[in-house]
C-alpha cells in the first residue's frame, strides 16, 4: 500500500497512459518542510521501478525520463532517504502502456435475408489493451448516412439495425469503421457494395419430397424461398455416406426433379439459395430433410448352394442354402423367398414361400432328375430365379480337385489352395469352396458357408464365419455341366494343444486283444483340428516308460483295438489328442487285466 502523497508529489508527463515505445517523464518533489530535518542537501530522493532503484538525486526534487516500458502496468515509487533512518515513501505512480488501434482489416457487411438488418464485421488487429471506441459508418444514395458505436475492448461486430431494400438493387453503399482510443485512431479502408452484394438469403425452408406413383425414378423435391432468389444448389447423399451429390439450378421456383436416386435408400437433402448469378453470397444450407426412397423390384440373382444326404435306399435329404441379396440388389425389404422344387421328367413341381430363413430342407426320392429355383421377393416384385439341377456333387472322381491344402492366413482367415482335376482342367466351369464347423456327429444344423471361384483360380481366402481354435471341414468342388467332383480337408485359422484328452468309456476283450472306446473331446476343448489320438499303457505299479499307439484322427472313429497286452497283467491306460500345436493333457486313466491265454 502506498500512502497518499502527504510529504510530496509525483507528476507524470505526458500522461499515465502512454504509447508502447514512448518516453514518460516522472518528477518527484518534496513539499515544504518535508525533507530530512537538519540539512536539506542531505535529502536523497530515490525512484524505484517496482522494487528496483532506477534513479536518485540529492535535493528537493528528482526528474527521471523512463523509456522501454512493457505493455501493461509498471509501478514507480518515490522514496526519501535520510542519514541514519529508513527510507520513507513519498508518493507513487502507475504507468499503463498500451497501443494505438491498428487499421481495422477485412471489413465486410451482410444482411441476412431480405427482411434482415445490415451488420458488419472486421478484424481489430493487435490488442490495444485499452478502451477503444469503434464507430461504424454507412453512407448511401441521397447523402443518407447511418452511424453506430461500440465501446468495448474487444469490439469487432456491429449491427446498424437498418434494412436495405431491393428498390434500387444496384445503388452503392459505403461502410467504414474507425477505431479510437486515448493513444490514437485508425480507419479501415472503405467497403463499397450494393444490395445484391450483401444480402445473404435465408436458407430455404419447408422442404418436402414427392415420389409419383411410388417410383424412385419420378422424384421431385419442393421447398420455399425468399422472393428474390434466382439460384439454388441442392446437395443430397445416402445417410450412410460422407460424399454429397451437388446440383446447381437456376429459376427453380421451389422445385426440382431428381433422376439418379437409388431405391429403398434413406437420403439426406439440403438446399441453399442465392440472389444473383455472380454477386452476393449463398445462404446457409437449409435444415436437412431425411427421406427414404420407395422400393423397386429386386435385381440380381440369389447365390444358391445345396447339400445332399442319403437317408435310405429310396430317399435323400436336400438342404438348400442361399445368401441374402446385397442392399443395392434387394432394393427393398425382402418379404419372402420362393423355392420351387421340380422333377424334370415327370414335371411335378412344388412351390414354397420361406420367411425368416435363408435355408430350406426337404426329403425327395433318390430316383428322378430334380431341379430347384429360388427367388427373393419384396413389395414390388421378385428377383430372377436362380436355377440349380440337383446332382451328386462328388460323383465324378476325375473332376476332384487335387492336392487340396488349408493354411492359416493371419487372424481368422484360412487360405485354401488346390490343383485342377486330372480330367481336362478346361472343362471346369467353376469351383465352389464350402466350409462348416466340424462336428463329430455330422450335425446338419451346423451353418454352411461357401464361396464361388472362377475356373482359372486355384486358391481362395475364406474369412466369413471363421473363428479361432475351431476346426472346419473344407470341401472344394469342381463343377462341369451336370457333373461335379470334390475333395475335402480339415483346416483351422489358429490352433493350440487340446485342453483335455479323450475320455475312455469302455475296454472290452476280444480274442486275446482289447478294444478301447472313448468319447470325443468336446468341440470347444479341441482347440483346432485334431491330427492324432495316442493311447498309452503301462503295467500298474511299474516305473517303466509307457508304451503308446498313435492313431490318425478320423471324425467318426471312437474305438481302436490293441493286441500287445500280456494276459493276467493289470495295465493302466489313458489317451491324449494332438493338434499341430501339441499334445493335450491325459484323459482319464482306466485299469484293465486281459483274461485270455498268452499266444
Amino acid at each position: 500500500k502506498i500512502d497518499a502523497c502527504k510529504r510530496g508529489d509525483v507528476t507524470v508527463k505526458p500522461s499515465h497512459v502512454i504509447l508502447l515505445g514512448s518516453t514518460v517523464n516522472i518528477t518527484c518533489s518534496l513539499k515544504p518542510r518535508q525533507g530530512c530535518f537538519h540539512y536539506s542537501r542531505r535529502n536523497k530522493l530515490i525512484l524505484y521501478k517496482f522494487d528496483r532503484r532506477i534513479n536518485f538525486h540529492h535535493g528537493h526534487s528528482l526528474n527521471s525520463q523512463v523509456t522501454g516500458l512493457p505493455l501493461g502496468t509498471t509501478l514507480f515509487v518515490c522514496k526519501l532517504a535520510c542519514i541514519n533512518s529508513d527510507e520513507i515513501q513519498i508518493c507513487g505512480a502507475e504507468i499503463f502502456v498500451g497501443v494505438a488501434p491498428e487499421q481495422p482489416q477485412n471489413l465486410s457487411c451482410i444482411q441476412k435475408g431480405e427482411q434482415g438488418t445490415v451488420a458488419c464485421t472486421w478484424e481489430r488487429g493487435r490488442d490495444t489493451h485499452l478502451y477503444t471506441e469503434y464507430t461504424l459508418q454507412l453512407s448511401g444514395p441521397k447523402n443518407l448516412t447511418w452511424q453506430k458505436q461500440c465501446k468495448d475492448i474487444y469490439c469487432d461486430y456491429l449491427d446498424f439495425g437498418i434494412n436495405l431494400t431491393p428498390e434500387s438493387p444496384e445503388s452503392n453503399f459505403t461502410a467504414k469503421v474507425t477505431a479510437v482510443n486515448s493513444l490514437g485512431s485508425s480507419s479501415s479502408l472503405p467497403s463499397t457494395f450494393t444490395f445484391l452484394d450483401i444480402v445473404r438469403p435465408l436458407p430455404p425452408w419447408d422442404i418436402r419430397i414427392k415420389f409419383q406413383k411410388a417410383s424412385v425414378s419420378r422424384c421431385t423435391l419442393y421447398w420455399r424461398d425468399e422472393g428474390l432468389v434466382l439460384l439454388n444448389r441442392l446437395r443430397y447423399r445416402p445417410s450412410n455416406s460422407r460424399l454429397w451429390n451437388m446440383v446447381n439450378v437456376t429459376k427453380a421456383k421451389g422445385r426440382h426433379d431428381l433422376l439418379d436416386l437409388k431405391p429403398f435408400t434413406e437420403y439426406e437433402f439440403q438446399i441453399s439459395s442465392k440472389l444473383h448469378l455472380y454477386k452476393g453470397s449463398w445462404s446457409d444450407w437449409s435444415e436437412s430433410l431425411r427421406a427414404q426412397t420407395p422400393e423397386e423390384e429386386p435385381t440380381g440373382m440369389l447365390d444358391v448352394w445345396y447339400m445332399k444326404r442319403h437317408i435310405d435306399y429310396s430317399r435323400q435329404q436336400i438342404s438348400l442354402f442361399w445368401k441374402n441379396l446385397s442392399v443395392s440388389e434387394a432394393r427393398g425389404k425382402i418379404l419372402h423367398y420362393q423355392v420351387t422344387l421340380q422333377e424334370l421328367t415327370g414335371g411335378k413341381a412344388m412351390t414354397q414361400n420361406i420367411t425368416g430363413h435363408t435355408s430350406w430342407t426337404t426329403v425327395i426320392p433318390r430316383t428322378g432328375n430334380w431341379a430347384v429355383a429360388v427367388s427373393a421377393a419384396n413389395s414390388k416384385g421378385s428377383s430372377l430365379p436362380t436355377r440349380i439341377n440337383i446332382m451328386n456333387l462328388c460323383e465324378a472322381g476325375l473332376l476332384a480337385p487335387r492336392q487340396v491344402s488349408a493354411n492359416s492366413e493371419g487372424m481368422d482367415n484360412i487360405l485354401v489352395t488346390w490343383q485342377p482335376p486330372r480330367k481336362d482342367p478346361s472343362a471346369v466351369q467353376e469351383y465352389v469352396v464350402e466350409w462348416r464347423e466340424l462336428h463329430p456327429g455330422g450335425d446338419t444344423q451346423v451353418p454352411l458357408n461357401w464361396l464361388r471361384s472362377r475356373p482359372y483360380n486355384v486358391s481362395a481366402l475364406i474369412s466369413e464365419n471363421i473363428k479361432s481354435y475351431i476346426c472346419y471341414e473344407i470341401r472344394v468342388y469342381a463343377l462341369s455341366g451336370d457333373q461335379g467332383g470334390c475333395s475335402s480337408i480339415l483346416g483351422n485359422s489358429k490352433h493350440k494343444a487340446p485342453l483335455s484328452g479323450p475320455h475312455i468309456n469302455a475296454i472290452t476283450e476280444e480274442k486275446g486283444s482289447i478294444l478301447i472306446s472313448w468319447n470325443s473331446i468336446p468341440v470347444q476343448e479341441q482347440m483346432g483340428c485334431l491330427l492324432h489320438y495316442r493311447i498309452y499303457w503301462k503295467e500298474r505299479d511299474s516305473n517303466s516308460q509307457p508304451q503308446l499307439c498313435e492313431i490318425p484322427y478320423r471324425v467318426s472313429q471312437n474305438s481302436h483295438p490293441i493286441n500287445s497286452l500280456q494276459p493276467r497283467v493289470t495295465y493302466v491306460l489313458w489317451m491324449t489328442a494332438l493338434t499341430a500345436a501339441g499334445e493335450s493333457s491325459h484323459g482319464n486313466e482306466r485299469e484293465f487285466c486281459l483274461q485270455g491265454k498268452a499266444n
Epitope: I2, D9, V17, G92, E94, F96, H129
Partner: nanobody
Framework: QVQLQESGGGLVQAGGSLVLSCAAS????????MSWYRQAPGKQRELVAE???????TYADSVEGRFTISRDNAKNIVDLQMNSLKPEDTAVYYC?????????????WGRGTQLTVSS
C-alpha cells in the same frame, strides 16, 4: 462498469475560481486513473488533469499551476480545483475513470458539466 456523475459547473467571471466534483459509483474497485477532460465547441476533446490511485498527477500545460486535481480513494471522488479562470477555459468538462479489466484498461465517461468563463 462504473457510473460517473459530474457536478459544480456553471458561469464564472474571468479570474474567478470553481471546483468541479466527480463521484464514481457501481463497480468502482480498482480504478487506476481518474481524469478530467474538456471539449470546447468545434474542438477535439483534450486532457485537463488526471490522478492515479497512488496520488501521482498529470496536468495539461495550459492549466499547470492554476488547476489542482485531488482524489479521495475511499469515497471514489475526484475534484478539480480551478483558479485564475480564463475565457479559453470555457468548455464541457467530462470526468473519466479507467478501471482494470483483466490486463486491459476499460474507460467510463460521465455525461459532462458545462463551465462558462465570461470576460
Amino acid at each position: 462498469q462504473v457510473q460517473l456523475q459530474e457536478s459544480g459547473g456553471g458561469l464564472v467571471q474571468a479570474g474567478g475560481s470553481l471546483v468541479l466534483s466527480c463521484a464514481a459509483s457501481g463497480s468502482a474497485a480498482l480504478i487506476f486513473l481518474m481524469s478530467w477532460y474538456r471539449q470546447a465547441p468545434g474542438k477535439q476533446r483534450e486532457l485537463v488533469a488526471e490522478v492515479s490511485r497512488y496520488g501521482s498527477t498529470t496536468y495539461a500545460d495550459s492549466v499547470e499551476g492554476r488547476f489542482t486535481i485531488s482524489r479521495d480513494n475511499a469515497k471514489n471522488i475526484v475534484d478539480l480545483q480551478m483558479n485564475s479562470l480564463k475565457p479559453e477555459d470555457t468548455a464541457v468538462y467530462y470526468c473519466k475513470a479507467d478501471q482494470y479489466y483483466g490486463d486491459s484498461l476499460r474507460s467510463s465517461w460521465g455525461r459532462g458539466t458545462q463551465l462558462t468563463v465570461s470576460s
